[in-house]
């Protein structure tokens, strides 16, 4: 039930795909830290 | 405790609209996607529709796409389901229900509430 | 979209009976697998998440499995108040789809 958000994408999954079935607050703010942590040339939980 | 208490079911004829409303309590309802899952009579359960936070993402089963909209109004803790061009299969109990976020499950479900589409 | 089938649709059994009910996707769904029980006139309860973890309240008669596309639902001694229809639904991707459903009836 209690998930961190993906290091890497699965399979046929790109950002956009992620980013539309985003649900919660929380899944916004992980979504958008991943984001970020990308950037810095590394993925972050 | 968490609450999720609905209302606006009833009777009405085909083609015609009815809205449905879920008032939610206990719980940070603005943070929260919610779902609309239906049963029709002597059936199994169909997932309906999703709103997630901020009203930012929303999806449709094929079934009701074009005729049904989902919102919400976090100023007064309540989602919507308006139900526009209702057939006869529209026929269900409808529920409201909440999870945790994108991929967990429902943890809360709303009490259900009849809707029949009938002439 | 993934379709999910239950089996049995239905089953009799009696109180004290260890209880068995499977559920299988169309394609991978990892550990995205809830159960629900649902008695007439009543919402669905939710009984399982993450394919094997107990929902908060839930006595540990009841048990989950599996991963990938096969899962199971154990009650392990059935009392009375077991009797009800039970569903999976996999939430690993939209549209969220629910198993036809098991009942499970009083032998």
């Known amino acids: 039930k209690h998930k961190c958000f993906r290091n890497s994408l699965e399979n046929n999954e790109t950002l956009e795909s992620i980013m539309n079935t985003l649900e919660s607050e929380e899944d916004f703010r992980k979504y958008f830290y991943y984001l970020e942590g990308s950037k810095g040339g590394g993925g972050s939980k | 405790q968490v609450q999720l208490v609905q209302s606006g079911g009833g009777v009405v004829q085909p083609g015609r609209s009815l809205r449905l409303s879920c008032a939610a309590s206990?719980?940070?309802?603005?943070?929260?996607?919610m779902h609309w899952v239906r049963q029709a009579p002597g059936k199994g359960l169909e997932w309906v529709a999703v709103?997630?936070?901020?009203?930012?993402?929303?999806h449709y089963s094929d079934s009701v796409k074009g005729r049904f909209t989902i919102s919400r109004d976090d100023s007064k803790n309540t989602l919507y389901l308006q139900m526009n061009s209702l057939r006869a299969e529209d026929t269900a109990v409808y529920y409201c229900?909440?999870?945790?976020?994108?991929?967990?499950?429902?943890?809360?479900w709303g009490q259900g509430t009849l809707v029949t589409v009938s002439s | 979209d993934i379709q999910m089938t239950q089996s049995p649709s239905s089953l009799s059994a009696s109180v004290g009976d260890r209880v068995t009910i499977t559920c299988r996707a169309s394609?991978?769904?990892?550990?995205?697998l809830a159960w629900f029980q649902q008695k007439p006139g009543k919402a669905p309860k939710s009984l399982i998440y993450?394919?094997?973890s107990l929902q908060s309240g839930v006595p540990s008669k009841f048990s989950g499995s599996g991963s990938g596309t096969d899962f199971t639902l154990t009650i392990s001694s059935l009392q009375p108040e077991d009797f009800a229809t039970y569903y999976c639904?996999?939430?690993?991707?939209?549209?969220?789809?629910f198993g036809g459903g098991t009942k499970v009836e009083i032998k």
């Open positions: 229900a909440k999870r945790e976020g994108y991929r967990y499950a429902y943890d809360y």
């Open positions: 206990g719980f940070s309802f603005s943070s929260f996607g």
């Open positions: 709103i997630s936070y901020g009203g930012i993402n929303k």
């Open positions: 394609q991978g769904i990892s550990n995205y």
């Open positions: 993450g394919a094997s």
């Open positions: 639904q996999q939430y690993n991707s939209y549209p969220l789809t």
